[in-house]
């Protein structure tokens, strides 16, 4: 035992300080990651801190600037893209955000061989999406909802579609609901592997009801924003998929890909497109009632210049206990024979695992198994399959990368990351070069994030790409909260939780408790990741205990937990938060008179229902941009979990699960309701209806709106929001300011 003189101990204590709200709002303790922009098996590009575009060659250890910051600055470029033939770079500027993924920008093409910008036949502006072909330097782009093709950057464009119309017909880009709830991309066009064909989606929103809201701006009259937005049960977009030969685009024009008969018989969605070869494509379709998905493999018929999708190449995925897939239906990863593929779906025990499909789904060979889940397939090579899972040490909130040797029999499995930096790193993602010759690992925590480069054959670490040294040094004199991840076993349900404890936590004392909740279907809040954020500050400086709980409906712990909320949103998610709070009180260090709950989006819905549960557990709570009724939210998301709001389907639960129906129950809690008026996602309508119900019930509450702000409440609104919520909580918990 080494006794340290108290003098030394005190001086150490004195140099340490708690986190401040300013630290959080300024992003003082944010971290960096390093994702190589791979351009071959052993080369990658990276945008340096001073904005040069640098090529790194792993095998020579050399790097050189291919595009100077001077050239970047000449057009105010913030992003770039090298053509696969390495002759040209597109430079992106005038970024203008639209929705979650979409934005418009101005594009300039720089000719590396001649050291100058391409003049003549310049691109129009603003462009909605632009990309290079996978080989050579053809360009496809979307302008005013139509698709254009250039054989070379200096050539005149060939117009592929002509029917594009704002808010009516979208070609090559998704409409609002497909972008947010189905594709999760800003694009809806896909080049074939060698650039011979270009596939694209056409979305017809002509009959979709429009959400309209005011954008106040600075003018005398506000503008009205109109978005075709199908709410639950409303008319949906009509989707068609076309493919055009880019070598001879005028020859036969775009050819439509047929929809499988069992899908086309009623309302349906297109969910993803995966090219297999230049003449084979795989499309995934989904019934509007989202428990049946069809994967259709189509082949090019040279003689007819059409695409043929034989019934024998249709693979059906159906769920009898919930919806198809997890959050989305998984996508296939094809093997080298160009017909068989690997895919993640539920096994007979109800855990999502990798399966190998050679002929039929019924004959699928299960590749992984166990009471854990395979989460992502990163890469399949001739001899290895790389994937991530939460198998290691049975912590669902971890992610490790595994390699399965598929070239040998029986296949052997190796965890690539499990023992690399075990304390620091338990949550990984990966990025692979061509043929998986090299890969980057990005570790997100629980320690300070670190990005490393590895040999794809031996898994040997080659170098550290980013280790966040500055962050590590900055945190040396900060009293960070303690974090623990544990589980509660309640009525055959496992509730994993993360508890964030004040730095000087003492189990014999009583602390105020704040529950942070999201709780949406197929989400996960309890993850082994690093974060210094608002709740870190609340624990460090304000002495609160914060808890996050993954209840029923959350992901990666099997279908029993995931599908428990099917057709019953707003019930078990809330019950499980309440159950966890009762268990936390039993632990003895929670002041049961000072318990609060807060959440954003789906979390705002859950926190509102928890406050209105009538349990008397919560003193106060906050809902930021909450859903208040499932009839107000998007069809694709809502119906996946709730079915349709019709009498003969699930209208009754749609009505029973609203926040408004529980207005009376808010009488005995302090409620802070917050929403942006320009929220395109969870419309302000949701909070307007809560407020109206509370007023009609003569229930007092607090509210804050953010003018012209969307679902993210970004910029200066963020500072105002967190300052406002901090004051509210400190008042609720009787903490001095």
């Amino acid at each position: 035992i080494v006794l340290r003189p108290s003098r030394v101990h005190n001086s150490e204590e004195n140099t340490m300080r708690a986190l401040t709200l300013k630290d959080i709002l300024n992003g003082t303790f944010s971290y960096k990651t390093f994702f190589p922009n791979w351009i071959s098996g052993q080369e990658y590009l990276h945008q340096s801190a001073d904005n040069n575009i640098v090529l790194y060659n792993i095998e020579t250890g050399q790097s050189y600037t291919i595009l100077s910051n001077r050239t970047m600055k000449s057009v105010n470029a913030s992003n770039y893209g090298l053509s696969p033939d390495r002759q040209f770079v597109y430079l992106e500027s005038d970024y203008s955000k639209l929705w979650r993924y979409s934005y418009t920008a101005t594009y300039y093409i720089y000719d590396l061989s001649n050291g100058e910008f391409v003049r003549g036949n310049e691109l129009p502006r603003p462009i909605q999406y632009l990309c290079w072909s996978p080989v050579g330097s053809k360009l496809a782009y979307v302008y005013q909802n139509n698709i254009y093709l250039k054989q070379r950057p200096g050539d005149p464009p060939f117009q592929i579609t002509f029917n594009g119309r704002e808010n009516k017909i979208f070609n090559g880009i998704p409409d609002w609901v497909y972008e947010e709830e189905m594709l999760a991309t800003k694009y809806a066009l896909w080049w074939s592997p060698n650039g011979k064909f270009l596939a694209y989606a056409e979305f017809n929103d002509t009959d979709i009801p429009v959400i309209a809201y005011s954008y106040y701006g600075d003018e005398q009259y506000p503008r009205t924003i109109n978005i075709p937005y199908p709410k639950a049960g409303a008319k949906n977009p009509v989707v068609r998929i076309f493919i055009i030969d880019t070598t001879y685009p005028a020859y036969v024009g775009p050819q439509e890909v047929p929809v499988p008969a069992m899908i086309a018989s009623s309302d349906y969605y297109f969910s993803w497109l995966t090219w297999v070869t230049d003449e084979r494509v795989c499309l995934q379709w989904l019934k509007r009632v989202q428990n049946v998905s069809v994967l259709s493999i189509c082949d090019f018929r040279e003689d007819w210049q059409t695409w043929d999708c034989p019934k024998t190449q249709e693979h059906i995925e159906e769920s009898r206990t919930g919806w198809a897939g997890g959050f989305f239906v998984s996508t296939p990863v094809f093997s080298y024979d160009a017909i068989s593929y690997y895919k993640i779906f539920s096994d007979k025990d109800g855990y999502k695992h990798i399966h190998y499909i050679k002929d039929t789904v019924e004959n699928a060979i299960q590749i992984t198994s166990g009471k854990w889940e395979a989460i992502n397939i990163f890469r399949v090579t001739q001899d290895s399959l790389f994937y991530s899972s939460n198998e290691f040490e049975e912590y669902p909130g971890r992610r490790n990368i595994y390699r399965i040797s598929i070239g040998s029999y029986p296949p052997s499995k190796k965890c690539v990351t499990c023992h690399l930096r075990k304390e620091r790193c338990q949550y990984y993602t990966a990025s692979f070069s061509d043929y998986a010759k090299y890969y980057a690992l990005v570790c997100y925590g629980p320690g300070i994030p670190i990005s490393t480069l590895h040999d794809g054959r031996t898994d040997q670490e080659i170098k550290i790409l980013e280790e966040n040294k500055e962050l590590e040094n900055a945190l040396k004199n900060i009293q960070l909260p303690k974090e623990e991840i544990k589980k509660l076993e309640v009525d055959e349900i496992t509730l994993w939780y993360k508890m964030i404890l004040p730095p000087q936590f003492d189990r014999s004392k009583k602390y105020p408790l704040l529950i942070q909740v999201y709780g949406g279907p197929c989400s996960q809040s309890v993850r082994s990741v690093f974060a210094v954020n608002w709740i870190s500050y609340l624990a460090s400086k304000e002495g609160m205990v914060i808890a996050l709980v993954d209840g029923r409906g959350t992901a990666f712990q099997g279908d029993k937990l995931l599908y428990a909320v099917y057709r019953k949103l707003g019930v078990y998610e809330v019950e499980d938060q309440i159950t966890a709070v009762r268990k936390f009180i039993e632990m003895g260090f929670i002041d049961e008179k000072r318990i609060a709950i807060w959440g954003w989006s789906y979390g705002g819905y859950v926190s509102s229902l928890a406050l209105a549960s009538g349990t008397g557990l919560f003193k106060c709570g906050i809902a930021v941009a909450p859903v208040s009724s499932w009839e107000y939210y998007a069809s694709v998301y809502t119906e996946r979990f709730m079915g349709l709001p019709t009498k003969d389907d699930n209208l009754e639960h749609y009505k029973n699960s609203t926040v408004m129906a529980r207005a009376e129950y808010f009488r005995n809690v302090d409620y802070l309701l917050i929403h942006g008026t320009a929220d395109d996602n969870v419309h302000f309508q949701n909070s307007a209806q809560i407020a109206k119900a509370l007023v009609n019930a003569q229930v007092d509450f607090q509210a804050m709106w953010y003018s012209d702000q969307n679902h993210g409440l970004s910029g200066l609104s963020t500072n105002h929001l967190y300052t406002h919520m901090t004051h509210f909580l400190k008042q609720c918990f009787s903490l001095s300011d």
């Epitope: 071959s40 098996g41 080369e43 090529l55 060659n57 020579t60 050189y64 090298l82 390495r86 010759k437």
Partner: nanobody
Framework: QVQLQESGGGLVQPGGSLRLSCVAS????????MAWYRQVPGKRRELVAG???????NYADFVGGRFTISRDNAKNGLYLQLNGLKPEDTAAYYC?????????WGQGTQVTVSS
């Protein structure tokens, strides 16, 4: 700094063949991605063929299977075999890194295809 020196050009009849060579003075790793480019007077320089350190190749559409890029790591050499030459292949041919570095353009080697 590495210097790149092209050779092997000349006058050839349509349908004829040539083998262009590029030798690097100074150490040039076999892992460097290299390429052949060409330029017709009054026109922009363009890529003919590229090869990565891993041996992956890329050819311009106009090549149409007529040319082959290769390298000899022992000799620090990069080569371009030109077969089935056409009058429109007449140009100065250059080797450079792939993508090219502005300071590394050499004198080039002239290929003239004419009957």
């Amino acid at each position: 700094q590495v210097q790149l020196q092209e050779s092997g050009g000349g006058l050839v009849q349509p349908g004829g063949s040539l083998r262009l060579s590029c030798v690097a003075s100074g150490r040039l790793s076999s892992s460097n991605s290299m390429a052949w480019y060409r330029q017709v007077p009054g026109k922009r320089r363009e890529l003919v063929a590229g090869i990565t350190g891993g041996g992956e190749t890329n050819y311009a559409d106009f090549v149409g299977g007529r040319f082959t890029i290769s390298r000899d790591n022992a000799k620090n050499g990069l080569y371009l075999q030109l077969n089935g030459l056409k009058p429109e292949d007449t140009a100065a041919y250059y080797c450079n890194f792939w993508p090219p570095l502005i300071n590394y353009w050499g004198q080039g080697t002239q290929v003239t295809v004419s009957s």
